[in-house]
């Protein structure tokens, strides 16, 4: 389970993104950002610093469908 506001790195970060984003999928750099393709957007934010659930969700690929 995701523990808020912690450092997440490597496979643990990938697992957490899969958990948070589910079927939506995810990416490591937001498409709208000016960060280069190989720059580690979420890695810098979540591994080298710390991140919360809201920040993680910004890296999910598509918005969750509302029922």
């Amino acid at each position: 389970a995701y523990r808020p506001s912690e450092t997440l790195c490597g496979g643990e970060l990938v697992d957490t993104l899969q958990f948070v984003c589910g079927d939506r999928g995810f990416y490591f750099s937001r498409p709208a950002s000016r960060v280069s393709r190989r720059s580690r957007g979420i890695v810098e934010e979540c591994c080298f610093r710390s991140c919360d659930l809201a920040l993680l969700e910004t890296y999910c690929a598509t918005p969750a469908k509302s029922e």
Partner: antibody
Framework: EVQLLESGGGLVQPGGSLRLSCAAS????????MNWVRQAPGKGLEWVSS????????LYADSVKGRFTISRDNSKNTLYLQMNSLRAEDTAVYYC???????????????WGRGTLVTVSS | DIQMTQSPSSLSASVGDRVTITCQAS??????LNWYQQKPGKAPKLLIY???RLQSGVPSRFSGGGSGTDFSLTISSLQAEDFATYYC?????????FGQGTNLEIK
């Protein structure tokens, strides 16, 4: 040629300081996270510190936290390790290592320097 | 921290032999496992990442397997240049820990 070249090692007394450098060439240094890994004589490999591609984030092993500082100058394609309050147990060969990119969502050190020896002794 | 335990610590073998080194993680690390080769006085060299993916330029006699907590590195037919020390490393979480190494010697 793609390579990393460390320098700055040497003999230093306990409590002393040393600054290691790692010059990168042959690749776009500024897009890779970088690392320092050390190896005490006759021992195994130990991760020491990591720095994000921008230099905005850093991580340290508990054994060096508060004593070592990792930094980088992307304009000079150079990685640094400032080592203060050195102890005998810091004696090791220090390697700089490049992190993999995120193309496969896996992490590994795909390029290593030849290492520089740091000896802490009175 | 995740502890990585390699076995055996040392191994004697002959050219042409098939050799397997194992690595065990103290926690489930999925397939976030790398293998490195190091020769005396040289820097480590990446052989395998993601448990089983061969790094570019590494001979196909090297192969990796496993998932979760148990992993292996196999050399199908030892060559003279393969005598070295081998390390496993997990990249599931920080700190990225290494195994203690397996020294592969000539019998």
């Amino acid at each position: 040629e793609v390579q990393l070249l460390e320098s700055g090692g040497g003999l230093v007394q306990p409590g002393g300081s040393l600054r290691l450098s790692c010059a990168a060439s042959g690749f776009t240094f500024s897009v890779y996270d970088m690392n320092w890994v050390r190896q005490a004589p006759g021992k195994g490999l130990e991760w020491v510190s990591s720095i994000s591609s921008s230099g905005g984030g850093t991580l340290y092993a508990d054994s060096v936290k508060g004593r070592f500082t990792i930094s980088r100058d992307n304009s000079k394609n150079t990685l640094y390790l400032q080592m203060n309050s050195l102890r005998a147990e810091d004696t090791a060969v220090y390697y700089c290592a490049r992190d993999s990119d995120t193309s496969s969502y896996y992490w590994y050190y795909d390029l290593w320097g030849r290492g520089t020896l740091v000896t802490v002794s009175s | 921290d995740i502890q990585m335990t390699q076995s055996p610590s040392s191994l004697s073998a002959s050219v042409g032999d098939r050799v397997t080194i194992t690595c065990q993680a103290s926690h489930d690390i999925s397939n976030y496992l790398n293998w490195y080769q190091q020769k005396p006085g040289k820097a480590p060299k990446l052989l395998i990442y993601a448990a089983s993916r061969l790094q570019s330029g590494v001979p196909s006699r090297f192969s990796g397997g496993g998932s979760g907590t148990d992993f292996s590195l196999t050399i199908s037919s030892l060559q003279a240049e393969d005598f070295a020390t081998y390390y496993c490393q997990q990249s599931y979480s920080f700190p990225r820990t290494f195994g203690q190494g397996t020294n592969l010697e000539i019998k």
